[in-house]
Interface confidence: medium
């Protein structure tokens, strides 16, 4: 009974040509989207010309299909049970599922100001980008369409810059027509608790980004885990889309079209200061921004963004210290819409339903030498979008899920 | 061609306010930035209020700061001046202005006034009691 | 304020220049107005775009925080006061020049 199921389910989920598990990660069976939300800025002038706080108003769904292509350069390595692979990134936008088109509109702040400003902070040098930020007519703010914002425009500041540059600026400039990896992942053929587990990202097992243990690359990619998932787990997962490993503990138990799956959930400790959870001490890089490390729900992932200061929290910033949000009007988080959760069924360990959540997030100072910034008088973590990508088990799949695995061991 | 006319102009008593509205035609009104200069008998121009095209972007002139208001219906193509408490010094020809943009370029503090490409023929207003 | 020439002249067909300066690199309007208090008419916005309607006759250029109005081959109906506008740091704020008199000899 138990036994065959225990042995049947190990063999089904290795990694390697024939199996259900194979078939499904090559190339997901599931329709996968991402939804943004854009954080529209109300009241630019305001902003930079008396420091207020920043009114934003969200707007969106604005919806895409990704994750639809397979998984390319698919190489198994029978000598240390490895498959590795890259995932190339695609996203068709989807009208029907959106509010508006992507020549829609959004006052957002000037991502090349912001960056520039704060990755120049020589004031000589400083002295210069003013110059050519006002000659290029650019300013704190902007207006960008939602196609420019996400997948690049040529920025008129940068390109009077007198050396060579990248011009193009986007918040996930270059996405199409480029793939994330190396990942290199055990098959689970010598040791089925270790299936779908990273043991090289780009080559390496750590980052670069962070001290210590906060550098490792832990657990999988949260698509599966290990099977035979207890409640008592910490799950662990690596999301390059945040240049850190993080994890998920049981929250509760859901039923999902027939299948019973444990819900996991990214808890409020994972995103807590080290005042209050001292593991994470390695993810606070400066003193200043962070109030001495003891501001929480925001990662400043700049290693990760080549020195540009991107920040990465929940939407709305849900789980952040009150001075983070402070100086933005208009946020409001709630935990049911803004919080990441995975639904994994715990016979095989595979991710039937999720929902990832983030916000993208620019830090923006003040400073006395470039004119679209000198009449600040704090610092602000500008909110730039949030997105909520999901993927849930098709009914087809669903059938098939009960009556080859959860039927038969009921 | 592009239009602009101005009206409510006039005499007016000291303390007192006074409403101009700008009447546009000859072009997608509310795809530009519209403002409002003035210019004092015998003096240059001075910048006086300025609104984007979607009504979001407003910017006053340190002179009028506190008592000027400007509003625009894009459905009817006006755009309208609200200044209270008027004083002597308020008295000039008030010109509405057309931004060739749908925004005005602010600097740290205002809107540049290099990207006006059209303008209103002007509505004399007098302040006196 | 922004700093322009209080008048310049010349003669029919010559080139003039009025020149403004601000106090950093800028970008300039430049607006005619032919007596004090009438109709005012944009002959360059944004440093160097003329409008459709204004002769090819007049141009406009920046050089670091000075802009120019040039006016090629000018006419006796080019007389007229010249303002430039832009924004002055140095003030922080939304700036005209003073106005330069254009006399046409």
């Known amino acids: 009974g138990d036994l065959l199921i225990q042995k049947t389910i190990k063999k089904q989920v290795v990694l390697e040509e024939g199996t259900i598990a194979f078939k499904n990660w090559v190339k997901t069976g599931t329709e996968v989207y991402r939804q943004f939300w854009i954080f529209d800025v109300q009241n630019p002038q305001e902003v930079m010309m008396n420091s207020s706080n920043i009114q934003v108003k969200q707007r969106g769904p604005y919806t895409y299909r990704v994750r639809f292509l397979a998984k390319e350069n698919v190489t198994q390595d029978a000598e240390d049970n490895t498959v590795s692979f890259l995932q190339p990134n695609g996203a068709i936008f989807e009208p029907s599922l959106s509010v508006g088109t992507e020549a829609d509109n959004f006052t957002v702040l000037n991502l090349a100001v912001a960056a520039a400003s704060h990755i120049y902070q020589n004031q000589f040098v400083q002295m210069i980008l003013n110059s050519l930020i006002n000659k290029s007519k650019s300013s704190m703010f902007q207006v960008r369409t939602l196609r420019e914002l996400l997948w690049g425009y040529r920025d008129p500041f940068l390109s009077l810059v007198p050396y060579p540059v990248t011009t193009t600026v986007g918040l996930f400039y270059p996405y199409n027509n480029t793939a994330d990896g190396v990942y290199k992942v055990f098959n689970g053929k010598d040791n089925i608790s270790k299936v779908a587990i990273i043991d090289t990202y780009k080559g390496k097992r750590n980052l670069s980004y962070w001290e210590s243990h906060c550098d490792m690359i832990n657990g999988t990619d949260a698509a599966s885990f290990p099977p035979f998932v207890e409640k008592s787990q910490v799950l662990q997962f690596f999301s390059s889309d945040i240049c850190r490993s993080i994890y998920a503990v049981f929250e509760s138990d859901v039923n999902l079209k027939g299948i019973p799956v444990y819900r996991f959930v990214l808890p409020s400790k994972a995103f807590a200061s080290p005042v209050e959870n001292p593991d994470n001490y390695c993810f606070c890089t400066e003193k200043i921004i962070s109030k001495n490390c003891t501001s929480y729900g925001v990662l400043d992932i700049s290693k990760c963004k080549e020195g540009r200061p991107v920040y990465i929290s929940l939407p709305h910033f849900l789980y952040a210290s009150p001075d983070v949000s402070e100086p933005i009007d208009g946020l409001n988080p709630n935990e049911e819409e803004h919080r990441t959760y995975l639904d994994i069924e715990p016979i095989t360990g595979f991710t039937l339903q999720f929902a990832k959540r983030l916000q993208v997030n620019l830090l923006v100072k003040p400073s006395e030498k470039i004119q679209v910034l000198k009449n600040l008088k704090r610092n602000y973590i500008v909110p730039i979008l949030w997105l909520n990508e999901t993927g849930t088990i098709g009914d087809e799949k669903a059938n098939m899920f009960r009556s080859q695995v959860t039927g038969k061991i009921n | 061609a592009v239009t602009l006319d101005e009206s409510g102009g006039g005499l007016q008593t000291p303390g007192g306010a006074l409403s101009l509205v700008c009447k546009a035609s000859?072009?997608?009104?509310?795809?530009?930035?519209m403002g409002w200069v003035r210019q004092a008998p015998g003096k240059g121009l001075e910048w006086v209020a300025g609104k984007a095209k979607d009504g979001g972007g407003t910017a006053y002139g340190s002179a009028v700061k506190g008592r000027a208001t400007i509003s625009r219906d894009n459905g009817q193509s006006t755009v309208r001046l609200q200044l209270s408490n008027l004083r002597a010094e308020d008295t000039g020809v008030y010109y509405c202005?057309?931004?060739?943009?749908?925004?005005?370029?602010?600097?740290?503090?205002?809107?540049?006034?290099?990207?006006?490409?059209?303008w209103g023929h002007g509505t004399e207003v007098i302040v006196s009691s | 304020a922004l700093t322009q020439p209080s008048s310049v002249s010349a003669s029919p067909g010559e080139t003039v220049k009025i020149t403004c300066s601000g106090s950093?690199?800028?970008?300039y309007g430049w607006y005619q107005q032919k007596s004090p208090g009438s109709a005012l008419v944009t002959v360059i916005?944004?440093?160097?775009n003329r409008p459709s309607s204004i002769p090819s006759r007049f141009s406009g250029s920046t050089s670091g925080s000075t802009g120019t109005l040039t006016i090629t081959g000018v006419r006796a109906d080019d007389e007229a006061v010249y303002f430039c506008g832009s924004f002055d740091s140095s003030t922080d704020s939304t700036a005209f020049g003073a106005g330069t008199t254009l006399t046409v000899l």
């Open positions: 000859g072009f997608d009104f509310s795809s530009y930035a």
């Open positions: 202005a057309k931004s060739a943009y749908g925004d005005w370029f602010y600097g740290s503090s205002g809107p540049y006034a290099d990207s006006i490409d059209a």
């Open positions: 916005y944004d440093s160097t």
């Open positions: 950093s690199d800028s970008w």
